[in-house]
């Protein structure tokens, strides 16, 4: 004969535990039902009656099966530098993440407590580490043969154009100026931008190049004094 299914509340066998979605009530000394997500325990179980559950009130939630007497309060509304990526419902807390161009400087269990604007690299410096949802941009000086003429949290240093005849040599913050209208390199127009960090997915892809057999002439130019260590602006 099949074993008889025990209905809550019931006294567990010695040494055994309560089943999934049940909890052991110390007062009643019985296995009792938990409340489903979105509910809380309005009345605890006794030896003869099971847990009575009730729905969470507005702006409160429970995410797990539980027997808490009160639902948890949803977090406060998202600040102006944040976006709400998950609304407050009876079953889940509000989640605030940083808006594009910002990163989370102080995280909490879910979402972000404090957002800060991504550092912007000033001219002569480029992004050497893109910002992510949780980390700031790192700026580094443009290497010989490359430049950045922008103040940006996304632009990397780009190679100088190669001129048939150079009118003005390029430097770390300015591209070379050619006397002819046909520089020898073909490049996509405009500055190269790094993608802004995305809250919902980690961004991907950029590769790592390798070693040169011999340095190109661009690298043989005198390097001059090292630029200031801080290649960023606060805004």
């Amino acid at each position: 004969l099949p074993a008889q299914v025990a209905f809550t509340p019931y006294a567990p066998e010695p040494g055994s535990t309560c089943r999934l979605r049940e909890y052991y009530d110390q007062t009643a000394q019985m296995c009792c039902s938990k409340c489903s997500p979105g509910q809380h325990a309005k009345v605890f179980c006794t030896k003869t009656s099971d847990t009575v559950c009730d729905s969470c009130e507005d702006s409160t939630y429970t995410q797990l099966w539980n027997w808490v007497p009160e639902c948890l309060s949803c977090g406060s509304r998202c600040s102006s530098d944040q976006v709400e990526t998950q609304a407050c419902t009876r079953e889940q807390n509000r989640i605030c993440t940083c808006r594009p161009g910002w990163y989370c400087a102080l995280s909490k269990q879910e979402g972000c407590r404090l957002c800060a604007p991504l550092r912007k690299c000033r001219p002569g410096f480029g992004v050497a580490r893109p910002g992510t949802e949780t980390s700031d941009v790192v700026c580094k000086p443009c290497a010989p043969g490359t430049f950045s003429n922008t103040t940006s949290s996304t632009d990397i240093c780009r190679p100088h154009q190669i001129c048939n005849v150079v009118a003005i040599p390029g430097n770390a913050s300015m591209d070379a100026v050619c006397t002819s209208t046909s520089p020898t390199r073909s490049m996509a127009p405009g500055a190269v931008h790094l993608p802004q960090p995305v809250s919902t997915r980690s961004q991907h892809t950029q590769p790592t190049p390798e070693p040169s057999t011999a340095p190109s002439t661009s690298f043989l130019l005198p390097m001059g004094p090292s630029p200031p260590a801080e290649g960023s602006t606060g805004d």
Epitope: R129, P159, L194
Partner: antibody, heavy 118, light 110 residues
Framework: EVQLVQSGAEVKKPGASVKLSCTVS????????IHWVRQAPGQGLEWIGR????????EYAPNFQDRATMTTDTSTNTAYLELSSLRSEDTAVYYC???????????WGQGTTVTVSS | EAVVTQSPATLSLSPGERATLSCRSS?????????ANWVQQKPGQAFRGLIG???DRAPGIPARFSGSGSGTDTTLTISSLQPEDFAVYYC?????????FGGGTKLEIK
């Protein structure tokens, strides 16, 4: 002249650790990340990680997160890679480099051969 | 973990021909903003960075090398192969906080 000079070949037993060095000259080490990349015999390139000598911040490939430690000594313009719990699959040539993919500053060390054998 | 797949593994061509090498990201589209980089390795020589930012040639790299990105692929094109171009080529992609290399494409003389 920009140079990255790496330490000499190493032979180690499984389970041991090895510490490789890369001494740079011709540029300010704080201006560029130092990368470590390896190439096993007959295989492709594998990125181990990079270190920012300016502040010591590091980023590792997931496979090396627990076993590799990158450090720098800016007073001697030297970068270090320590790899622990060596196994035979770690037998490779290890390169330090300034090539970053963000910077176009394209210089590489001559490589250090590490052999792991019992 | 992200996987970067290069194809073909070996490409046999003659000098003067056009070479097209492909690199695919396992985690979604590779676009201009994803900064696919290409690196050349010749036996007994140092590595050489060719392309950065998906389509920018590194300083000193000849104009016959070009990069492009579309969908999940990024491509290195060598418009007219020179004898010195026969080598192994690697692409590498940045995945949020680390680089991943492809397995490489060996470009050999037919």
């Amino acid at each position: 002249e920009v140079q990255l000079v790496q330490s000499g070949a190493e032979v180690k037993k499984p389970g041991a650790s090895v510490k490789l060095s890369c001494t740079v000259s011709g540029f300010n080490i704080k201006d560029f990340y130092i990368h470590w990349v390896r190439q096993a015999p007959g295989q492709g390139l594998e990125w181990i990680g990079r270190v920012d000598p300016e502040d010591g911040n590091t980023e590792y490939a997931p496979n090396f997160q627990d076993r590799a430690t990158m450090t720098t000594d800016t007073s001697t313009n030297t970068a270090y890679l320590e790899l622990s719990s060596l196994r035979s699959e770690d037998t490779a040539v290890y390169y330090c480099s300034t090539w970053d993919g963000f910077s176009y500053f394209d210089y590489w060390g001559q490589g250090t051969t590490v052999t792991v054998s019992s | 973990e992200a996987v970067v797949t290069q194809s073909p593994a070996t490409l046999s061509l003659s000098p003067g021909e056009r070479a097209t090498l492909s690199c695919r990201s396992s985690t979604g589209p590779v676009t201009t903003n994803n900064y696919a980089n290409w690196v050349q390795q010749k036996p007994g020589q140092a590595f050489r960075g060719l392309i950065g930012g998906t389509n920018d040639r590194a300083p000193g790299i000849p104009a016959r090398f070009s990069g492009s990105g579309s969908g999940t692929d990024t491509t290195l094109t060598i418009s007219s192969l020179q004898p010195e171009d026969f080598a192994v080529y690697y692409c590498a992609l940045w995945y949020r906080n680390h680089w991943v290399f492809g397995g490489g494409t060996k470009l050999e003389i037919k």
